[in-house]
Interface confidence: low
C-alpha cells in the first residue's frame, strides 16, 4: 500500500532512507535539457523474493533538444552545485547501508537525472532526518518518520528535529513563508 | 496516553520562594521542548518561556526573564518553574504545554493556580 | 514584545459562521507560517485546534478552518454550536525566537 503524502517536512532538514521497502517507487526524472527516453518506463520499482530485492527498470534520460545526441548540456553552476550535492548524497547512503531483507538499496545516479529524487514510499518504510549543513539538531530525540496505516488511512509519523542555525545558537530556527505555498512548510529536502 | 500533570494548587506570600512541576508521560519526554504559560485572572495567554529537557536548554520571553528560572530533570521526565521571591502580581494559573513539531503547542497540562497574598 | 491584537469579542447564533481576525507583524505572523489557534472552555486549560495556519489536529472538527494574509490570519468556524462557546486565541513564532500570543476573543453562541 502506498503512502497518500510525502513525509514530514522539518525546516532546514533533510531525510533519507537507509533502504526502500519493497513496492516503493521512484520517479525516473530527468535535468533540465533531458527527457526520459520513448520506451522507457516512467518509474523504478523495489521488487524481489525472500531472498533478493532489487530496482525493477532502469530510468534512461536522453537529450530533449532536435537532434538526437548523447552530449550532455553544461549545468548551470547552481545546477552543478546540487547536483554535486545529490551525486555526494547517493554515495553517502550506499556507503552505511546495510542489506535489509525485503529493502531494495538506493538506486545509483543515472545519466542525467535530475537533482531531486522523487520517491513514493509504502507503509512500513521509516525515513531519517538531518538538519543540513550549518544548522544543528536541537531535538535529541527520534529523528525519523515511519508511514503507518491507521484506521484504514495511511500517515507519517511527526520526527522530533528542530534544526537551528549554528552562527545564532540562542535561536530557534524558521524560514519566511513561501507567499505562493501558504499552507507547507519551506521546501528543503532533497528526496521526497 | 500522552499527557502533562502539573502538580497542585499553591497559596503563597509575598517574598516567598517557590517551585512547581510538571511532569511528561505517555511519549519520549526528553525528545520535546516544554513551554511554560501565564494566564492571569481574566486575562489571556502569556508565554513564558521553554526548555529541552534532553539537555536544559532553555530560552525565556523577555518579559520573564530574570524574573522566573525555568529548570528539568530529565531522569523524571518534568520540567520546573520556580520563583525565588514571589509578588501578588504573580497570582495567576500557570499552564505547561509540550511544543510539537509545528512549533504548535499541542498537549497542556491542567494548569497550576498560584495565589500570592498577604 | 507586542500581543496579537484579536476582537474582544464575537457572537453569532447557531448555524452561522465567525471569523476572528489576529493581527500581529512582519516579524511574526506575517514572517512564518507557524500561526496556531487554540480553544479554551471555561475553567479548562487551552487546545490547540489550527496549527501551521489552517491544519487540524485529528480529532477536530472539519468546521474549524484557517487561513493568513499579510500580518493577519483568521479563524473561521463554520455551521457554529451551542459547545463552541469558549476563548479563542491565536498564536505566533516570532522572529526573536520566542511566541507570542493574541489577547484572546470570547465567542458567545446566541441562544
Known amino acids: 500500500e502506498l503512502c497518500d503524502d510525502d513525509p514530514p517536512k522539518i525546516t532546514h532538514a533533510t531525510f533519507k532512507a537507509v533502504a526502500y521497502k519493497e513496492g516503493t517507487m521512484l520517479n525516473c526524472e530527468c535535468k533540465r535539457g533531458f527527457r526520459r527516453i520513448k520506451s522507457g518506463s516512467p518509474y523504478m520499482l523495489c521488487t524481489g523474493n525472500s531472498s533478493h530485492s532489487s530496482w525493477d527498470n532502469q530510468c534512461q534520460c536522453t537529450s530533449s533538444a532536435a537532434r538526437n545526441t548523447t552530449k550532455q548540456v553544461t549545468p548551470q553552476p547552481e545546477e552543478q552545485k546540487e547536483r554535486k550535492t545529490t551525486e555526494m548524497q547517493s554515495q553517502m547512503q550506499l556507503a552505511d547501508q546495510v542489506s535489509l531483507p525485503g529493502h531494495c538499496r538506493e538506486p545509483p545516479p543515472w545519466e542525467n537525472e535530475a537533482t531531486e529524487r522523487i520517491y513514493h514510499f509504502v507503509v512500513g518504510q521509516t525515513v531519517y532526518y538531518q538538519c543540513v549543513q550549518g544548522y544543528r539538531a536541537l531535538h535529541r530525540g527520534p529523528a525519523e518518520s515511519v508511514c503507518k496505516m491507521t484506521h484504514g488511512k495511511t500517515r507519517w509519523t511527526q520526527p522530533q528535529l528542530i534544526c537551528t542555525g549554528e552562527t545564532e545558537p540562542s535561536q530557534f530556527p524558521g524560514e519566511e513563508e513561501p507567499q505562493a505555498s501558504p499552507d507547507g512548510l519551506p521546501e528543503s529536502e532533497t528526496s521526497r | 496516553q500522552v499527557q502533562l500533570v502539573q502538580s497542585g494548587a499553591e497559596v503563597k506570600k509575598p517574598g516567598e520562594s517557590l517551585k512547581i512541576s510538571c511532569k511528561g508521560s505517555?511519549?519520549?519526554?526528553?525528545?520535546?521542548?516544554i513551554g511554560w504559560v501565564r494566564q492571569m485572572p481574566g486575562k489571556g495567554l502569556e508565554w513564558m518561556g521553554i526548555?529541552?529537557?534532553?539537555?536544559?536548554?532553555?530560552r525565556y520571553s523577555p518579559s520573564f526573564q530574570g524574573q522566573v528560572t525555568i529548570s528539568a530533570d530529565k531522569s523524571i521526565s518534568t520540567a520546573y518553574l520556580q520563583w525565588s521571591s514571589l509578588k501578588a502580581s504573580d497570582t495567576a494559573m500557570y499552564y505547561c504545554?509540550?511544543?510539537?513539531?509545528?512549533?504548535?503547542?499541542?498537549?497542556w497540562g491542567r494548569g497550576t493556580m498560584v495565589t500570592v497574598s498577604s | 514584545q507586542s500581543a496579537l491584537t484579536q476582537p474582544a469579542s464575537v457572537s453569532a447564533s447557531p448555524g452561522q459562521s465567525i471569523t476572528i481576525s489576529c493581527t500581529g507583524t512582519?516579524?511574526?505572523?506575517?514572517?512564518?507560517?507557524?500561526v496556531s489557534w487554540y480553544q479554551q472552555l471555561s475553567g479548562k486549560p487551552p487546545k490547540l485546534i489550527l496549527y501551521?495556519?489552517?491544519k487540524r489536529p485529528s480529532g477536530i472538527s472539519d468546521r474549524f478552518s484557517g487561513s493568513k494574509s499579510g500580518n493577519t490570519a483568521s479563524l473561521t468556524i463554520s455551521g457554529l454550536q451551542a459547545d463552541d462557546e469558549a476563548d479563542y486565541y491565536c498564536?505566533?513564532?516570532?522572529?526573536?525566537?520566542?511566541?507570542?500570543f493574541g489577547g484572546g476573543t470570547q465567542l458567545t453562541v446566541l441562544g
Open positions: 504545554a509540550r511544543l510539537g513539531s509545528a512549533y504548535a503547542f499541542d498537549i
Open positions: 505517555g511519549y519520549s519526554s526528553t525528545s520535546y521542548w
Open positions: 526548555i529541552y529537557p534532553g539537555d536544559s536548554d532553555t
Open positions: 512582519s516579524s511574526d505572523v506575517g514572517a512564518y507560517i507557524y
Open positions: 501551521d495556519v489552517s
Open positions: 498564536s505566533s513564532y516570532t522572529r526573536s525566537s520566542t511566541w507570542v
